[in-house]
């Protein structure tokens, strides 16, 4: 059974992930980003189901494409280079989903824009956090 300290750690990691995803969304989804329209042409694959931490496997698999899109943005949009930002997110995702169980991600038929993709994972984080508090 999860201890209160492990629950607290999970909550903090989710909050960190949430803030990173929100920062990316705010950095790209505004009219001051001249590459927004170009970024919206990139396809992202969405999870068929995202209700548990193991489903973060689906996010992990889309981090490389996410980095490619973020490379189009000006560095001033974020406080870190895309490579470092994605690396940080990857570390959190690996810790949260755990590496001891292998989970095969199932993707939905519908693809999404980067904005829809980020909003989906932001909602996921918020949902899990709410169950922990």
């Amino acid at each position: 059974a999860p201890t209160s300290s492990s629950t607290k750690k999970t909550q903090l990691q989710l909050e960190h992930l949430l803030l990173d995803l929100q920062m990316i969304l705010n950095g790209i989804n505004n009219y001051k980003n001249p590459k927004l329209t170009r970024m919206l042409t990139f396809k992202f694959y969405m999870p068929k189901k995202a209700t548990e931490l193991k489903h973060l496997q689906c996010l992990e698999e889309e981090l490389k494409p996410l980095e490619e899109v973020l490379n189009l943005a000006q560095s001033k949009n974020f406080h870190l280079r895309p490579r470092d930002l994605i690396s940080n997110i990857n570390v959190i995702v690996l810790e949260l989903k755990g590496s001891e169980t292998t989970f095969m991600c199932e993707y939905a038929d519908e693809t999404a824009t980067i904005v829809e993709f980020l909003n989906r994972w932001i909602t996921f984080c918020q949902s899990i956090i709410s169950t922990l508090t």
């Epitope: 009219y31 001051k32 001249p34 329209t37 970024m39 919206l40 042409t41 693809t111």
Partner: antibody, heavy 119, light 108 residues
């Protein structure tokens, strides 16, 4: 209604210059990145250049880099394309086009203006 | 350089289904968009993000994408659908806009 009205086309000799204008109305011009797209007679569409909402960032197709300059005057709601060292292959209908902020394409186009480069 | 490949022309009778293809290596990771351009007019967006239809575009226009191929379908083509159709996307790396060569649709 949302509109882009173009002016400034015409016939020009190779090596000479020409400036196109695109007047925007019906939307907050300063909130949108803008583009120029061209179409040679009987041919397909070719993206030419993009300018950011405030004019600070500009991107060009390789075919016009160093010869064409895009600019904007947000106080006049107007987009410009300065074309220098014109070549016969620049002969085309030139369209100004607005970048959509919600989908990855151009959502509003000007009526087009013909530029003919000929001696 | 990256290219989007379309058939140059297609002819259908009124009421028939017109299917226009667009091939691009990046389509598994890029959305396809479709513009209609009638003679002497500016292009009009008829499909975005592979399958979505802008408001005001008739339901007979639909889009799909699978692998490296995007498709525009006009179910029950009408005489007023006669136009050039261009697929559009962006390059895989720098994401500069790119158009297909266009398909001239004749409805007669």
């Amino acid at each position: 209604q949302v509109q882009l009205v173009q002016s400034g086309g015409g016939v020009v000799q190779p090596g000479r210059s020409l400036r196109l204008s695109c007047a925007a109305s019906g939307f907050t011009f300063s909130n949108y990145a803008m583009n120029w797209v061209r179409q040679a007679p009987g041919k397909g569409l070719e993206w030419v250049t993009l300018i950011s909402y405030d004019g600070s960032q500009k991107y060009y197709a390789d075919s016009v880099k160093g010869r064409f300059t895009t600019s904007r005057d947000n106080s006049k709601n107007t987009l410009y394309l300065q074309m220098n060292s014109l070549r016969a292959e620049d002969t085309a209908v030139y369209y100004c086009a607005r970048d959509s902020t919600t989908l990855g394409a151009f959502d509003v186009w000007g009526q087009g203006t013909m530029v003919t480069v000929s001696s | 350089s990256y290219e989007l490949t379309q058939p140059p022309s297609l002819s259908v009778s009124p009421g028939q289904t017109a299917t226009i293809s667009c091939s691009g290596d990046a389509f598994p990771r890029k959305f396809a968009y479709w513009y209609q351009q009638k003679s002497g007019q500016a292009p009009v967006l008829v499909i975005y993000e592979d399958t979505r239809r802008p408001s005001g575009i008739p339901e007979r226009f639909s889009g799909s994408s699978s692998g490296t191929m995007a498709t525009l379908t006009i179910s029950g083509a009408q005489v007023e659908d006669e136009a050039d159709y261009f697929c559009y996307s962006t390059e895989p790396t720098v994401a500069h806009p790119i158009f297909g060569g266009g398909t001239k649709l004749t409805v007669l």
